[in-house]
């Protein structure tokens, strides 16, 4: 897990600068990750102490598997309510292959522009859930660079659940996510050991793409 | 300085609602969620939610839903919490406070209390 | 939920000796990502409201005196007023804030022996 999270007193003023995020959540539907519940549950906890609207923070999922679907835009809902019931309506829509550098350039690509929400100098914020090493892990790179141009902050989780349950090696894949992370790497990279254990990160990330709004 | 006035006493009857409020000064009353904590005679304290003053989303406790309604007035700084269908075992101190961090609930200033009496 | 459970329910101290309240959590509060455990303690005196003295188990609020200090981890954890003083008489509270619902301990009504 992440090394220690700091949060000193000086913290606080933080939270009287309340400018404007675009987020998207890329999330991995692929048939491994289980069970999907925990991953409902984990957007519940991280967006419901979001401030959602059209001159607020404007959130947008992707899920990947084989494919990538926009599951809704970054402008589709005005209010943290209406996102909170959208998000739980989210299904899993599975796939036996994991194109994770497929779901993150189409987030770039497609979900950060204006059509879909995305506003002009207002920062821009990707989250990306997976449980598993991408198939397409030879276009990762490229991919991250094309999100670093574009100034796209990103933070990265893993999840260890399949490679725990089939006793495997996580090493590889855990140097993968960090990949994608953005720089420090141990303040935008976390790994969980399983789905259900996504809501124990819920609150240092929230604070962390929080904190980069007074940045 | 960070100051959190409630309201006045409240003597009610069964059934009744009572609504307190929270005038918050010292500092910007969007940036910070309020918090609701109650207290009954020779009781300890309950959380009873919290609301985002900016966007007014809501989490209430199991305990409260339905019964519970927390606003807030961000032109007058002021927070609210309403509780209906009272009961004598509301009889308590209600204290609104405030978390310092969004996603971390200890709370660093509460208000002063104020006294809710549920009697027939 | 998160049950807090504080013990002693109440403790008689002499003037400048040590109190030590003890609070356990039926579960870990302990925040893996971040490595702190989310756990908070207040001061409470007759007629006027809660005071925080500490937050992240250890960590004392601006302007609380060095005499209070919080330790432990996980699930159990100490609040210590190393040398007691006459304006210390009140009820002290634990809290956790790893989940809401947030819970608070029984308390424990500290007085002057």
């Known amino acids: 897990v992440s090394p220690t999270f700091q949060v000193v007193n000086s913290i606080a003023p933080v939270q009287e600068c309340s400018t404007q995020l675009d987020i998207v959540i890329v999330l991995d539907g692929s048939n491994s990750i289980y069970p999907w519940d925990s991953v409902t549950a984990f957007l519940n906890d991280l967006l419901e102490r979001m401030d959602i609207g059209p001159k607020q923070t404007q959130v947008g999922i992707v899920q990947y598997g084989e494919n990538v679907t926009h599951e809704f835009n970054l402008n589709k809902y005005s209010s943290t309510e209406e996102v909170l019931v959208a998000a739980k309506k989210i299904v899993q829509r599975g796939g036996r292959q994991t194109m994770t550098a497929l779901g993150i350039d189409t987030a770039r690509k497609e979900a950060f522009t204006e059509a879909r929400g995305a506003r002009r100098g207002v920062k821009k914020v990707m989250v990306i859930v997976t449980d598993g090493e991408s198939h397409d892990n030879h276009r990762l790179k490229k991919v991250i660079q094309d999100c670093e141009d574009e100034n796209i902050q990103r933070f990265s989780i893993a999840i260890l659940g399949s490679y725990n349950r089939g006793n495997l090696s996580t090493e590889k894949f855990v140097e993968e996510i960090k990949s994608i992370a953005s720089e420090p790497t141990e303040k935008h990279f976390f790994n969980v050991s399983d789905e259900l254990a996504l809501v124990t990160i819920v609150k240092t990330l929230g604070e962390r793409i929080f904190a980069l709004e007074a940045t | 300085q960070v100051q959190l006035v409630q309201s006045g006493a409240e003597v009610k009857k069964p059934g009744a609602s009572v609504r307190v409020s929270c005038k918050a000064s010292?500092?910007?009353?969007?940036?910070?969620?309020m918090h609701w904590v109650r207290q009954a005679p020779g009781q300890g304290l309950e959380w009873m939610g919290w609301i985002n003053p900016n966007s007014g989303g809501t989490n209430y406790a199991q305990k409260f839903q339905g019964r519970v309604t927390m606003t807030r007035d961000t032109s007058i700084s002021t927070a609210s919490m309403e509780l209906s269908r009272l009961r004598s075992d509301d009889t308590a101190v209600y204290y609104c406070?405030?978390?310092?961090?969004?996603?971390?609930?200890?709370?660093?200033?509460w208000g002063q209390g104020t006294l809710v009496t549920v009697s027939s | 939920d998160i049950v807090m459970t504080q013990s002693p329910d109440s403790l008689a101290v002499s003037l400048g000796e040590r109190a030590t309240i003890n609070c356990k959590s039926s579960q870990s509060v302990l925040y893996s990502s971040n490595n702190k455990n989310c756990l908070a303690w207040y001061q409470l005196k007759p007629g006027q409201p809660p005071k925080l003295l500490i937050y992240?188990?250890?960590t004392r609020e601006s302007g609380v005196p060095d005499r209070f200090s919080g330790s432990g981890s996980g699930t159990d954890f100490t609040l210590t007023i190393s040398s007691l003083q006459a304006e210390d008489v009140a009820v002290y509270y634990c809290?956790?804030?790893?989940?809401?619902?947030?819970?608070f301990g029984g308390g424990t009504k500290v007085e002057i022996k």
């Open positions: 406070a405030r978390a310092p961090l969004r996603y971390f609930d200890w709370l660093d200033y």
């Open positions: 010292g500092y910007t009353f969007t940036g910070y969620f």
């Open positions: 992240w188990a250890s």
């Open positions: 809290q956790q804030y790893y989940s809401t619902p947030l819970t």
